[in-house]
């Protein structure tokens, strides 16, 4: 019964953690730069994303502009994409395959192999996690570098958006739901029987104990 | 006092090479990038690039990329620019210059080293 | 590349003149704008940067204003060290670049 709520736990988590990756990867909160203008008066606040970029004026308007050229855009870019995308599928392959061999399901009967699916599931989880994590802690590593290098013009310098706060959360509830997922099986299933399991009970030999000794060997 | 002691003039030959330097004096020189502007006789400014002395990152302008290379020797808190493959386009006063702590501007500049470059 | 564009390549002026300098972006630089003053022989002198900040040194007859695209750099009854080419430049994005330099000469 504590499996079955775990796996649930697990779940439910990576679900949670699948359309927090959902939303931080299409949102084009990754990079945010508030451009000054006079004194402190904020002339526009610049949006960038893996897919779009936005400008909100300071009149409220907001235009936004859909990446044309996938050749023309930036390797890192381009890897940030494609392991979003990647997460996502193998996120979701997992809820899939958790799905299959969850406790409370009759996919599969045997509950050795039950085991394995929800182990599978839960290590297909903890990778799609670290693959959002990633693209979310490379994005951030470039963003501080490129604050505090002084090299680097204004116009350059960027600032951590949402997305990023919320691909780390998402990566988190990934990873977690997928050890959860991972922690649900217990090891006596991919343990093979050493002898052949009898079917009687073997007596005991101290009376006192009152114990039957089950699938002695 | 800041200082920017630039080297002497240099005359060249086409195609060839020439390292100018920079000897910098009177703050802590790992502080503050170091930039290196070109001023052909009565024309505007153009700015090449610059060096981050703490750990030798540079950026350039597209226009001199492969043709100068900045570097630094803290050491002698000196920084350097080479320019290679040299034409007559490249005959100009080079100035060194300190950028501004909080803004991309220049406070200082050196004197500023004559190139030309002749047969 | 930010083009900086200084209308007036020449102004002939005359001591205790107010001149106005103008310089035009090509696009927004959000007041990232310096302003120096170059003499004959001598290397540039920052005057003025963030558009409205002056450095210290800089004699207070000297002001800058602007916004967006447009600065200008005002100088109030002018006198004889005041004859020098004055250069604007730009420090929002890199390359940095520079306006095409105001001479001011005395009449």
């Known amino acids: 019964m504590a499996s079955t709520g775990l796996e649930l736990l697990g779940m439910t988590l990576a679900v949670l953690g699948w359309l927090g990756t959902l939303v931080s990867c299409a949102l084009p909160l990754w990079k945010v730069t508030a451009f000054i203008g006079n004194s402190i008066v904020v002339a526009q606040v610049v949006w960038e994303g893996l897919w779009m970029s936005c400008v909100v004026q300071s009149t409220g308007q907001m235009q936004c502009k859909v990446y044309d050229s996938l050749l023309a855009l930036p390797q890192d870019l381009q890897a940030a994409r494609a392991l979003c995308v990647v997460a996502l599928l193998l996120a979701l392959l997992g809820l899939l395959v958790a799905i299959t061999g969850a406790q409370c399901t009759t996919c599969v009967e045997d509950e050795g192999a039950k085991a394995r699916i929800v182990l599978t599931a839960g290590v297909l989880l903890l990778l799609s996690g670290i693959l959002v994590l990633i693209p979310v802690c490379w994005t951030a590593h470039a963003i501080i570098q490129d604050f505090y290098n002084p090299l680097v013009a204004e116009a350059l310098k960027r600032e951590l958006g949402a997305s990023l706060y919320l691909g780390w959360a998402a990566a988190a509830l990934l990873m977690l739901g997928g050890g959860l997922l991972c922690c649900t099986c217990p090891p006596s299933h991919f343990e093979r029987p050493r002898g052949p399991r009898l079917g009687y009970s073997i007596p005991s030999r101290s009376g006192a104990s009152g114990l039957d000794k089950r699938d002695y060997v | 006092e800041v200082q920017l002691q630039e080297s002497r003039p240099e005359l060249v030959k086409p195609g060839a090479s020439v390292k100018i330097s920079c000897k910098t004096s009177g703050y802590t020189f790992t502080e503050y990038t170091l930039h290196w502007v070109k001023q052909s006789h009565g024309k505007s400014l153009e700015w090449i690039g610059g060096?981050?002395?703490?750990?030798?990152?540079?950026i350039y302008n597209q226009k001199f990329k492969g043709k100068a290379t900045l570097t630094v020797d803290k050491s002698s808190s000196t920084a350097y620019m080479e320019l290679r493959s040299l034409t007559s386009e490249y005959s100009a006063v080079y100035y060194c210059?300190?950028?501004?702590?909080?803004?991309?501007?220049?406070?200082?500049w050196g004197q500023g080293t004559s190139v030309t470059v002749s047969s | 590349d930010i083009q900086m564009t200084q209308s007036s390549s020449s102004f002939s002026v005359s001591l205790g003149d107010r001149v106005t300098i103008t310089c035009k972006a090509s696009?927004?630089?959000?007041?990232?704008l310096a302003w120096y003053q170059q003499k004959p022989g001598n290397a540039p002198r920052l005057l003025i940067s963030?558009?409205?900040s002056l450095e210290t040194g800089t004699p207070s007859r000297f002001s800058g204003s602007g916004s967006g695209k447009d600065y200008t750099l005002s100088i109030t009854s002018l006198r004889t060290e005041d004859a020098a080419t004055y250069y604007c430049?730009?420090?929002?994005?890199?390359?940095?670049?520079f306006g095409t330099g105001t001479k001011l000469e005395l009449k």
């Open positions: 430049q730009q420090y929002w994005s890199t390359p940095l670049t």
């Open positions: 060096i981050n002395p703490n750990n030798g990152d540079t």
């Open positions: 696009e927004d630089i959000y007041n990232r």
């Open positions: 210059a300190r950028r501004a702590i909080t803004v991309y501007a220049m406070d200082y």
């Open positions: 963030g558009a409205t």
